[in-house]
Each structure stands twice: as structure tokens, then as C-alpha cells.
């Protein structure tokens, strides 16, 4: 069963998942001037058993101008997008995927991938919203939306978030007991296809809304 819509749009906000439920698909998209290799995967799929989940398939891109280039494996940590704001002493190595049964972590970037990610979510997936830089949340803390099924139909719950243009506070404000408001809980675990974008967020992030897709350039 497909989700009828994308996650709700909130003006001046972006959304992201903490982790991805099994069954989630990520399109293998390449940046301009590149294309998927012939016989390459169309998508990555989060699969697993009761104790271990991981992304099946590898996304591989090759230059549109060359025919025989098939190099493109997931980049090594030192080649991956730098996590500039964390001042890590060494590259952060993800822990074993088994630590999140039923879920996959954010897939690492692949060489020449597109600047936006298109995910196909399953029912029960939760995404979290935050105001973009330059806007503050009237409802403090991360708001969430859940893809849920009710009476045989899928829908996304409405996140409780309003972003207002106040430059002096962060997009994730709040010293005094901020909150996040869940609305509703998923009632079944059938599939829900949703096209959306994913982001590699930096604190100094900028986001623009184009039709129903949020686009953020990788930093």
C-alpha cells in the first residue's frame, strides 16, 4: 500500500528520518553529468532479519561521457563528506547495524550522487522537522510526522511546528523544556511509498522549497 502523499510541508522547515525502517527504498540518483552504470541498481533497499538490518545493493554512478567507467563503490570514510562541525579526533565509524534491529542508518554518500535523495518510506516511518536557518520554532523541539495506515488508507500525521522568521534564535531553540508533539501512532506495517528528499545537514544549512521537494546541497 502506497502512502497517498509526501510528508507534510511546513513553511521554512525541513524534515529527516533518524533511521529507516526495513522496506525503505532509496533511489540511486546521480548528479548532473553522471548516470547509473549499466546493470547498476535502481535503488538501495533496507532489508534484514530480527537482529540485523542493512542496505542491499550499491548505488554506482559513472560519467555520462565515458562508457566503460564502472569504478564507484561507497567512498571510504576519508573521502566522505566532511563532518565539519563535530571536530572529530578521527573519522566517525558507524557502529554495527545490528544495534538498530528493524532499521537502517543513513546510507553513506556514494561517488557523484545527486544532491537530493529520494526515499520511499514504509508505514510506521517517522520523520522529524526542524526550522531552516534564520527561522525559529514556535513549538519548541523537533516535531514529527508518521506514515500510518487508518481504515485501509495511508496518511502522514501533521507535525506540530510553526517556523517564524526570527534570526537571533537557532532553528532548534530552547533552554526551557522544549517538546516534540507526536500525533498518532502507526496501526500496521504495510508499505507506504513516499518520495522525499534527504539531507546531510550542517548547522549553517540553507533550504529552499521547490514544489513538493525540499532540496539541500550537500555541504
Amino acid at each position: 500500500e502506497l502512502c497517498d502523499d509526501d510528508p507534510p510541508e511546513i513553511p521554512h522547515a525541513t524534515f529527516k528520518a533518524m533511521a529507516y525502517k526495513e522496506g525503505t527504498m532509496l533511489n540511486c540518483e546521480c548528479k548532473r553529468g553522471f548516470r547509473r552504470i549499466k546493470s547498476g541498481s535502481l535503488y538501495m533497499l533496507c532489508t534484514g532479519n530480527s537482529s540485523h538490518s542493512s542496505w542491499d545493493n550499491q548505488c554506482q554512478c559513472t560519467s555520462s561521457a565515458t562508457r566503460n567507467t564502472t569504478k564507484q563503490v561507497t567512498p571510504q570514510p576519508e573521502e566522505q563528506k566532511e563532518r565539519k562541525t563535530t571536530e572529530m579526533q578521527s573519522p566517525m565509524q558507524p557502529v554495527d547495524q545490528a544495534s538498530l534491529p528493524g532499521h537502517c542508518r543513513e546510507p553513506p554518500p556514494w561517488e557523484n550522487e545527486a544532491t537530493e535523495r529520494i526515499y520511499h518510506f514504509v508505514v510506521g516511518q517517522m520523520v522529524y522537522y526542524q526550522c531552516v536557518q534564520g527561522y525559529r520554532a514556535l513549538h519548541r523541539g523537533p516535531a514529527e510526522s508518521v506514515c500510518k495506515m487508518t481504515h485501509g488508507k495511508t496518511r502522514w500525521t501533521q507535525p506540530q511546528l510553526i517556523c517564524t522568521g526570527e534570526m537571533e534564535t537557532s532553528q532548534f531553540p530552547g533552554e526551557e523544556k522544549p517538546q516534540a508533539s507526536p500525533e498518532g501512532r502507526p496501526e500496521s506495517e504495510t508499505s507506504c511509498l513516499v518520495t522525499t528528499t534527504d539531507f546531510q545537514i550542517q548547522t549553517e544549512m540553507a533550504a529552499t522549497m521547490e514544489t513538493s521537494i525540499f532540496t539541500t546541497e550537500y555541504q
Epitope: 529527516k16 562541525t85 526542524q130 532548534f172 530552547g174 539531507f199 548547522t203
Partner: nanobody
Framework: QVQLVESGGGLVQPGGSLRLSCAAS????????VSWARLTPGKRLEWVSA???????YYADSMQGRFTISRDNAKNTVYLQMNSLKPEDTAVYYC???????????????WGQGTQVTVSS
Amino acid sequence: QVQLVESGGGLVQPGGSLRLSCAASGFTFSSSAVSWARLTPGKRLEWVSAIASDGSTYYADSMQGRFTISRDNAKNTVYLQMNSLKPEDTAVYYCAIPRDGLVPVFGIDYWGQGTQVTVSS
């Protein structure tokens, strides 16, 4: 290599309390936000709480007023004090670090192995 080690879970009766700890290493702890999330028996992954590098705290509604997050930068440890526990709080609780180190929920990529909390009479 980043390491996150949770402890403090266990079996507790409804209305009881637990204090979870997350000991971190392998990165500059004081400049990073830390989140707690939980995986319910139905395999639902829920964000619980977060604390930013400046000490700002964030809570999900259902935990508001019952849970308190804090950090001790000298010990590279984050704590989650859980009071008035309910059966629906039963879950594996995970300590997590966002990939850019600052935004408490977005882009979490680094997880501990989790600690089981069971609330039952």
C-alpha cells in the same frame, strides 16, 4: 572510533525510576549534541530526548516532565533520568550522536548498542 556505551537499564515497576548513562569516546564530546532514542517491542523507533552542546534540552511530549536529560562533559557522559515510568516506556534505549554533531535529531548516524528498560509489575 566513536563509541557509545549505555548502561542503567533494567526491570522496574510502574511509577518507578531509572537513570540511564551514555559514556562516549572517540570524538570531541563537549562540542556534540547527544540524543536518546528508543526502540519499542513493536520495532518502533522513537526519539526521546536530546541535549545540545550548550546544555539546551529537548523532550518528546510523552516524556515531558517525567524524563530529564543532562550531561557531564568532564566525564564524557550523558544521563537520562526517567521517573514515573509506565509500561509503554518499555523499550531498548539508545544513545545517539547526530552526524554533524550539533542538531539533536537530524542525521543521526552513530548509535550505541542499547540498554533494555522493562516497566512491568
